[in-house]
């Protein structure tokens, strides 16, 4: 008789990242008997939900069920039927929903109610939908990248997981950029975290970590753009806004009502003598950079040092993984290589922004115009945020690693979130040693 292979003893988990601009579903898989080992959970699927973020469904919540269908059906296909009932599903909503909740708690609850009802109809173990805090978003992103880089493992390995991994156990800092917020999280060197709101204490795998984190709401790339437009239109002499952050020849009409829809532009709101205005791109990196800097208030700091807007930031320490939109934007601009210096990045941005809109469209025919038009702003914003906002320098720039995936798993908060909710990160180092390191190779 032939030996039959034993069925794989694996477990699955699903996390939906309900971001401000879109929702993504991630499926994770791990060997059941190695739940407490570091680095054994990996991503097997990402499904990007077609359409905007869930906060945009506030006036059409009856469409949420259909919106989620394709990716939930994909999860049904990927995960063996026998495991459906024990597969947990978590939905975490981030800054887009934080902003909606600021406007109206009832509207946010209305959206989440329908999301929960829709997801509960699938045969998985639905564990609810919630708006995670900015602090959680930062912390879980930090946990994710360090888990995937093997930084929590007590065994120092003679081989490297990823090209930029240093073989020491120093954790990486995490830089996350979304559409509506951005997070910075790292372990400062022997520095007291002067603001309690920014301090986190973890004990992971037998080691204590004092972690600094802050989430800047309204400083994601999309909300930062709305802020910049609202600021600039204040001083426009008519309905034409000549904007250095868009390519020369680019034109777009913006409704003033759309501009003031978000709580992020409230501080710039004023009565304008027109209902619409036209953005006319002039493509000048330096001017764009200057305009962006006006969004960061650096004149006030109640601590020994600050990032901006009076928020404490300790001196930067160690290597950083920059992911989500930091990565997507820099990848598009072909600036993710370890060898590209900050000076070179700035040069490339100057060149890119000054390119005419017609030429830009010709160079990237497959990229949707809406996204294509914003790369000049987004790239400039990333440089401004990292250099002037977080105080990276030309030297420390080399410690920023633009990361999309680590070992096939996306860098982002979702894996850390699931590891925490499924109790898969023990406080103490597990006694049993892993039988193999094959997951790392």
């Amino acid at each position: 008789t032939q030996n039959k292979a034993l069925p794989e003893n694996v477990k699955y988990g699903i996390v939906l990242d309900a971001g401000s601009s879109h929702t993504s579903l991630y499926i994770y898989k791990w060997p059941a008997e190695k739940e407490n080992d570091t680095g054994v959970v990996h991503q097997v699927e990402e499904c990007r939900v077609k359409g905007p973020g869930i906060s945009k469904f506030v006036q059409k919540v009856n469409e949420i069920g259909i919106y989620l269908t394709d990716c939930m059906e994909r999860a049904r296909e990927v995960i063996p039927r026998s495991q459906h009932q024990e597969t947990p599903v978590y939905l975490g909503a981030t800054a887009g929903m934080r902003l909606l909740r600021m406007e109206s708690e009832e509207l946010a609850d209305r959206v989440l109610d329908v999301v929960e009802r829709s997801l509960s109809n699938y045969p998985f173990d639905f564990q609810g939908a919630r708006i995670i805090t900015g602090q959680e978003e930062g912390a879980y992103g930090w946990i994710t990248i360090n888990y995937l880089l093997g930084k929590f493992s007590q065994k120092t390995r003679w081989f490297s997981i990823v090209p930029y991994e240093t073989n020491n156990q120093e954790t990486f800092g995490a830089l996350d950029l979304g559409g509506a917020s951005t997070q910075v999280t790292f372990v400062p060197q022997n520095q007291t975290i002067e603001s309690p709101d920014n301090a986190l204490q973890f004990r992971l795998y037998g080691k204590d970590y004092n972690v600094y984190t802050h989430s800047f709401l309204c400083y994601g790339k999309d909300q930062a753009l709305w802020q910049k437009l609202a600021k600039d239109i204040q001083v426009a002499s008519n309905e034409i806004l000549r904007d250095p952050c868009f390519h020369p020849g680019y034109k777009k009409v913006v409704n003033v009502s759309d501009l003031y829809k978000t709580p992020c532009t409230k501080r710039f709101e004023m009565t304008l003598p027109f209902q619409q205005f036209e953005i006319q791109g002039i493509g000048n990196y330096q001017q764009c950079h200057q305009s962006i800097l006006e969004l960061f208030n650096t004149s006030y700091c109640p601590y020994s040092q600050c990032a901006f807007n009076g928020i404490f930031l300790p001196p930067l320490q160690g290597d950083f993984g920059a992911f989500s939109a930091f990565y997507f934007v820099m990848k598009f601009l072909n600036l993710t290589s370890e060898k590209v210096s900050q000076e070179k990045v700035t040069e490339m941005m100057k060149k890119f922004c000054s390119k005419s809109w017609e030429e830009t469209k010709t160079s990237y025919p497959s990229v949707k115009e809406k996204y294509l038009s914003e790369y000049c702003f987004s790239g400039t914003y990333i440089l401004s945020l990292l250099l002037q906002g977080y105080h990276f320098t030309a030297d420390s720039w080399e410690h920023i690693h633009f990361i999309g995936k680590i070992q096939g798993s996306d860098a982002g908060w979702t894996l850390g979130y699931m590891l925490n909710l499924t109790n898969m990160i023990p406080a103490e180092q597990p006694l049993s040693t892993p039988l193999s390191h094959s997951t790392y190779v």
């Epitope: 919540v61 009856n62 949420i64 069920g65 009832e106 609850d109 209305r110 989440l112 109610d113 329908v114 929960e116 009802r117 829709s118 509960s120 639905f126 564990q127 609810g128």
Partner: antibody, heavy 121, light 107 residues
């Protein structure tokens, strides 16, 4: 004060379907979820499913998925629960109940009087 | 799904005495817990929601406590009309789930 009035008792044959109605009066109908809960003779309470009439969005317990359909008619402030492929184990009192806490608060504050459904050949 | 377990199944108490009913959730439900009273031939009636808030018209002798996974319903001094079956229900996650009930009977 909100009141829920359900349709009368039913006797059904195995394999058939039953549709129970629940009419609301004296309060907002659309915004609050309506849940359906059943109770077999001498047994506890079992949640079957729910709907928010405002959106027509229903969700169901896995056990009843594919066999139960919950709908609502805003114009008449009435919710309906239809259970198909009836078997003897479906003999129970079926209650509608209003989720009186608003969105995401599913405490059942107001109950109908119950509808006895007997499944017998 | 979240499993709700009630104990005891039956509680025999004399009128005027205190009754303490327990409810345990298989995972944390925060304070998303309700208690219902059901008398024979009647629909259930909401007594407590949010683990400890009395529903309107519910006498002060009924009180709820607890959060997370352990909850208690206390009837400080049982009246004749309080002899009934009591159910707990979690409403944090779908599906909504009820405990098996505690029958409070006259001793």
């Amino acid at each position: 004060q909100v009141q829920l009035v359900q349709s009368g008792a039913e006797v059904k044959k195995p394999g058939s379907s039953v549709k129970v109605s629940c009419k609301a009066s004296g309060g907002t109908f659309s915004k609050y979820g309506i849940s359906w809960v059943r109770q077999a003779p001498g047994q506890g309470l079992e949640w079957m499913g729910s709907i928010i009439p405002e959106f027509g969005i229903a969700n169901y317990a896995q056990k009843f998925q594919g066999r139960v359909t919950i709908t609502a008619d805003e114009s008449t402030s009435t919710a309906y629960m239809e259970l198909s492929s009836l078997r003897s184990e479906d003999t129970a009192v079926y209650y509608c109940a209003r989720e009186s806490g608003g969105y995401r608060d599913h405490r059942l504050g107001v109950w109908g009087q119950g509808t006895m459904v007997t499944v017998s050949s | 799904e979240i499993v709700m377990t009630q104990s005891p199944a039956t509680l025999s108490v004399s009128p005027g005495e205190r009754a303490t009913l327990s409810c345990r959730a298989s995972q944390s439900v925060g304070s998303n817990l309700a208690w219902y009273q059901q008398k024979p031939g009647q629909a259930p009636r909401l007594l407590i929601y949010g683990a400890s808030t009395r529903a309107s018209g519910i006498p002060a002798r009924f009180s709820g406590s607890g959060s997370g996974t352990e909850f208690t319903l206390t009837i400080s001094s049982l009246q004749s009309e309080d002899f009934a079956v009591y159910y707990c229900q979690q409403y944090l996650l779908w599906p909504l789930t009820f405990g098996g009930g505690t029958k409070v009977e006259i001793k």
